[in-house]
């Protein structure tokens, strides 16, 4: 058989023998020559070396590149390729000698005592195991143990060839520590070389640490790292570890495999790291490294040590916080610290408990803020082990967008007497304050709300063509005051008012209020009417349970059928504040009310009574009159707000004081509630009597002592009273000093 | 720098013996899986033989199965093959590998010629 | 063993072309395949892992993608210095197996 690239000027070797396969008997000479056109080698089996003493090769006598290759008494174990080649050259002359050996029928390897197989569990794997025959039509089986089995071939996946060996697929003796081929002469059953089976998984899945992140510890403490590696099956693992302080007389190391359920395609391996106590050297990277001698896979953590316990503010610890109302607010507690300290938050020097609207934790997390949240908050950090404190002061302010009282309060459908001068306010509250409010107008036909038109909850007026106050042609005569700032319900609040020097023409006014959070806006519809006039007796807005009547009246030659009406529920749903007139034109929506008629000289009255008004009556009440000469129904409409019987409550305290004979006290306290609370001080239980010392003003809210005696010391007592009953507050003020004696005594 | 070089190779005869050296340096060696890998002059990629950073478990490619052994000094950080039994189709590039996923850091190459 | 097939065995480019390696293997790696550059003389240098993770330093015109067992290796734009050869590698079961390469040289 001649081997390798065909040359142009060399022609192969040429063997004496010219065969593939040779086939001879143990104990004879094998005998052969190759000659060939420059220098030539042989190569034979097993260590294929010049070295072998049994081997001779020697120049022939008849001429030049000729070498004849020389065994005597072969054995089984020649069997195998020789091959004659040129120098440098892949050029060459291959024949297979079978040594037919029937004490030895298997070729060992010289350097084998046993043989290695590698397999992977795979089912569509094969392995060969290399036993090799020294004659060619051997009839072979396969050996494994333990247990012990025999595989024979199948004509199929399991075979053996005399020159390769035993073809078997490797699941079927992924089971066996060791294997071996048998083959069976005359009754006599001849054993390979033991191969012993060894099966090879290839992946490191990964490598995880535990503690992975964060490990924190001070000095003496002990260090216990764990370091798993998730494998396929099969795979062996050596550990490695790399840390800081290698001479470490304290460390330990544990490597275990670790059990997996059954049927699980994986193994886990663990390695233990641990240093009882640990110095300020053993600070730094851990890695641990898992080597299966085909994969290495590595993790890394950081171990800090600690000299002692200690606890202090991160530098990125926040002073200001600022959001707006409604948002969520998150305030971290950004410090360092070994241990982790305890963490307490303050309001106000007040503990904050978690509920449902703040969570008080490593982050302060405040729901939904809301105006009450602004404050200061303190964050106390404690460190559990050496009890040492760390405080820090965050200031949380909360915006609000510019929100416009009147637009809950005011009723849309107000209709206002031609030719009178109105004043239409806007009282908006906003945090910080509006850097500007903002006055527009337009025609009320301009902005019917006629059915034929699309109209929207969050936009009720199909119109869009506000024009500047500033252009009044073709509306009222307009004049816009000088934005007020008023403390109303305890709130700054800024007002601007918008004149109607005369209301000629039915028209919407909108005020637009921005800051630096949002906008705010109400419309005002302006219902010019020539029609009746409404009164309320004897009030603007009574308290729930007090009597209350709506007049109205007209002037009985021009008007007929005065009726009194209530709006009732709205077709649409629509926002407060936001719906067009006149109403005159859907009756549907109103229910009629009793009345009572009067007249004088000139005008009818009809009064509609409400006795113990509840919060049921509020609403919009329109008086409808029918003109004597046209029929045309004129309406008016008139919103009724009830207040809510509220009990009285002081709001802010009374502080415990001390002062100095001689000196003034000045305290106030301020008491809300409907109806408004009348306001008593006491001393020590009893009655404060005014006197030339002590100065009660405004409604009782502030109390003035002046030039304080020994006698002024006792205890103050504020009370707030109602029909609904009292609110009070105390304070304890002390007088120091010596009292002086006056010439009197 | 993180770097394999690689010594030892050389002309042998069919039967001869060589030993290859790699010395790592740049990395901590005794955590890694190494590797050699050869190139037959003009030809592909082939894997020859694996180890263990603790010399636990070795691995071979059957054509050199009982005539390379692989083998490690961590203290030295140093990978070895040594080589018995040489034939002519062990001519080749030996390459040593740190192996990670891959073969990430290979030494230089080292020729080793098998020729009577 | 699991033989890694890979075509073609050689392509002739020209700087700024797109070139496109296939490697295919005898059976199912799932995505257990690296690549690698050989330029002559030297030692091959790992390019991707995993089928598609890029080395860190490998520039971002060669990419890598397949599973199971047909990969794709391309060059989006291929620069002077991309000349090689080029291998893939399975790194499924034992024992390592590559291909036979694939050199990318001057049209």
């Known amino acids: 058989a001649s081997v390798g690239l065909p040359s142009v000027s060399l022609d192969l070797p040429r063997l004496s023998i010219q065969k593939d396969i040779l086939t001879i008997k143990a104990n004879t000479t094998l005998q052969i020559t190759c000659r060939g056109q420059r220098d030539l080698d042989w190569l034979w089996p097993n260590n294929q070396s010049g070295s072998e003493q049994r081997v001779e090769v020697t120049e022939c006598s008849d001429g030049l590149f000729c070498k004849t290759l020389t065994i005597p008494k072969v054995i089984g174990n020649d069997t195998g390729a020789y091959k004659c080649f040129y120098r440098e050259t892949d050029l060459a002359s291959v024949i297979y000698v079978y040594v037919q050996d029937y004490r030895s029928p298997f070729i060992a390897s010289v350097s084998d005592q046993h043989g290695v197989v590698y397999i992977t569990e795979n089912k569509n794997k094969t392995v060969v195991i290399p036993c090799l025959g020294s004659i060619s039509n051997l009839n072979v089986s396969l050996c494994a143990r333990y247990p012990e089995k025999r595989f024979v071939p199948d004509g199929n996946r399991i075979s053996w060839d005399s020159k390769k060996g035993f073809t078997i697929p490797s699941y079927m003796i992924s089971y066996a520590g060791m294997v071996f081929c048998e083959a069976k002469i005359n009754d006599e059953s001849y054993q390979s070389i033991m191969y012993i089976v060894v099966v090879v998984g290839y992946r490191i899945y990964d490598v995880v640490l535990s503690p992975s992140h964060g490990i924190e510890l001070s000095v003496g403490e002990k260090l216990v790292l764990n370091c798993t590696a998730r494998t396929e099956l099969n795979v062996g693992i050596d550990f490695n570890w790399e840390y800081p302080s290698s001479k470490h007389q304290h460390k330990k190391l544990v490597n275990r495999d670790l059990k997996t359920q059954s049927g699980s395609e994986m193994k886990k391996f663990l390695s233990t790291l641990t240093i009882d106590g640990v110095t300020r050297s053993d600070q730094g990277l851990y890695t641990c490294a898992a080597s299966s001698g085909l994969m290495t896979k590595k993790n890394s953590t950081f171990v800090r040590v600690h000299e002692k316990p200690f606890v202090a503010f991160g530098s990125g610890m926040e002073s200001l916080v600022e959001a707006t109302v409604g948002e969520r607010v998150r305030i971290p507690a950004k410090y360092l610290g070994y241990p982790p300290p305890e963490i307490k938050w303050y309001k106000n020097g007040i503990p904050l408990e978690s509920n449902h609207t703040i969570k008080a934790g490593h982050v302060l997390t405040i729901m939904e803020v809301s105006e009450r949240d602004t404050g200061n908050y303190t964050v106390i950090l404690t460190n559990p082990i050496s009890k040492e404190k760390q405080s820090h002061v965050v200031s949380l302010v909360v915006y609000v967008p510019p929100q416009i009282g009147e637009k809950s309060l005011i009723s849309p459908v107000d209709s206002y007497q031609y030719g009178t001068t109105q004043t239409l306010t806007c009282t908006v509250y906003a945090i910080p304050p509006p850097h500007h409010i903002h006055w527009y107008w337009q025609l009320e036909e301009e902005c019917a709300n006629e059915p034929s038109q699309a109209v929207s909850v969050t936009n009720p007026y199909p119109c869009e063509e506000w024009r500047s106050v500033e252009d009044f042609q073709g509306g009222n005569k307009i004049e816009v005051n000088k934005n007020q700032f008023a403390l109303i319900e305890g709130k700054n609040k800024t007002v601007s008012t918008l004149v109607i020097q005369a209301a000629n023409v039915s028209a919407l006014y909108k005020c637009e209020a921005v800051n630096k959070v949002g906008r705010g806006e109400r419309v005002i519809s302006f219902h010019v009417t020539r029609g009746p006039e409404i009164t309320l007796q004897p009030d603007m807005q009574p308290t729930e349970q007090e009597s209350v009547s709506l007049w109205c009246t007209a002037d009985r030659s021009t008007f007929e059928n005065l009726t009194w009406y209530k709006l009732g529920p709205q077709p649409l749903p629509i926002h407060v504040g936001e719906l067009p007139t006149p109403v005159c034109k859907n009756l549907d929506t109103l229910w009629k009310l009793n009345a009572t008629m009067f007249s004088n000289s000139t005008n009818d009255i009809l009064i509609m009574e409400l006795k113990n008004a509840s919060l049921q009556d509020q609403g919009d009440y329109v008086c409808l009159a029918q003109d004597r000469k046209t029929k045309k129904r004129h309406c008016v409409v008139r919103q009724l707000t009830v207040l809510e019987r509220v009990a009285p409550t002081i709001t802010g305290n009374l502080e415990n004081q001390t002062t100095s004979i001689g000196e003034s006290i000045e305290v106030s306290c301020t008491a809300s509630g409907n109806p408004p609370p009348q306001i008593m001080w006491f001393k020590d239980n009893e009655t404060l009597v005014e006197d030339s010392g002590i100065v009660l003003k405004d409604g009782n809210r502030n109390l003035t002592i002046r030039r304080v005696r020994k006698e002024d010391e006792g205890l103050y007592t504020c009370q707030a009273c109602s029909v609904l009953g009292c609110a009070k507050v105390e304070a304890f003020f002390i007088i120091e000093g010596a009292q002086e004696k006056t010439n009197l005594e | 720098e993180v770097q394999l070089v690689q010594s030892g190779g050389g002309l042998v005869k069919p039967g001869g013996s060589l030993r290859l050296s790699c010395a790592a340096s740049g990395f901590t060696f005794s955590s890694y899986s190494m590797n050699w890998v050869r190139q037959a002059p003009g030809k592909g990629l082939e894997w020859v033989s694996a180890i263990s950073s603790s010399s636990s478990y070795i691995y071979y490619a059957d054509s050199v199965k009982g005539r390379f052994t692989i083998s490690r000094d961590n203290a030295k950080n140093s990978l070895y093959l040594q080589m018995n039994s040489l034939r002519a189709e062990d001519t080749a590039v030996y390459y040593c590998?740190?192996?990670?996923?891959?073969?990430?850091?290979w030494g230089q190459g080292t020729l080793v010629t098998v020729s009577s | 063993d699991i033989q890694m097939t890979q075509s073609p065995s050689s392509v002739s480019a020209s700087v700024g072309d797109r070139v496109t390696i296939t490697c295919r293997a005898s059976q199912g790696i799932d995505n257990w395949l690296t690549w690698y550059q050989q330029k002559p003389g030297k030692a091959p240098k790992l390019l991707i892992v995993?089928?598609?993770s890029l080395q860190s330093g490998v520039p971002s015109r060669f990419s890598g993608s397949g599973s199971g067992t047909d990969f794709t290796l391309t060059i989006s734009s291929l620069q002077p210095e991309d000349f090689a050869t080029y291998y893939c590698q399975q790194a499924k079961a034992f024992p390592p197996t590559f291909g036979g390469g694939t050199k990318v040289d001057i049209k």
């Open positions: 590998a740190r192996v990670t996923d891959a073969f990430d850091i």
């Open positions: 995993e089928a598609s």
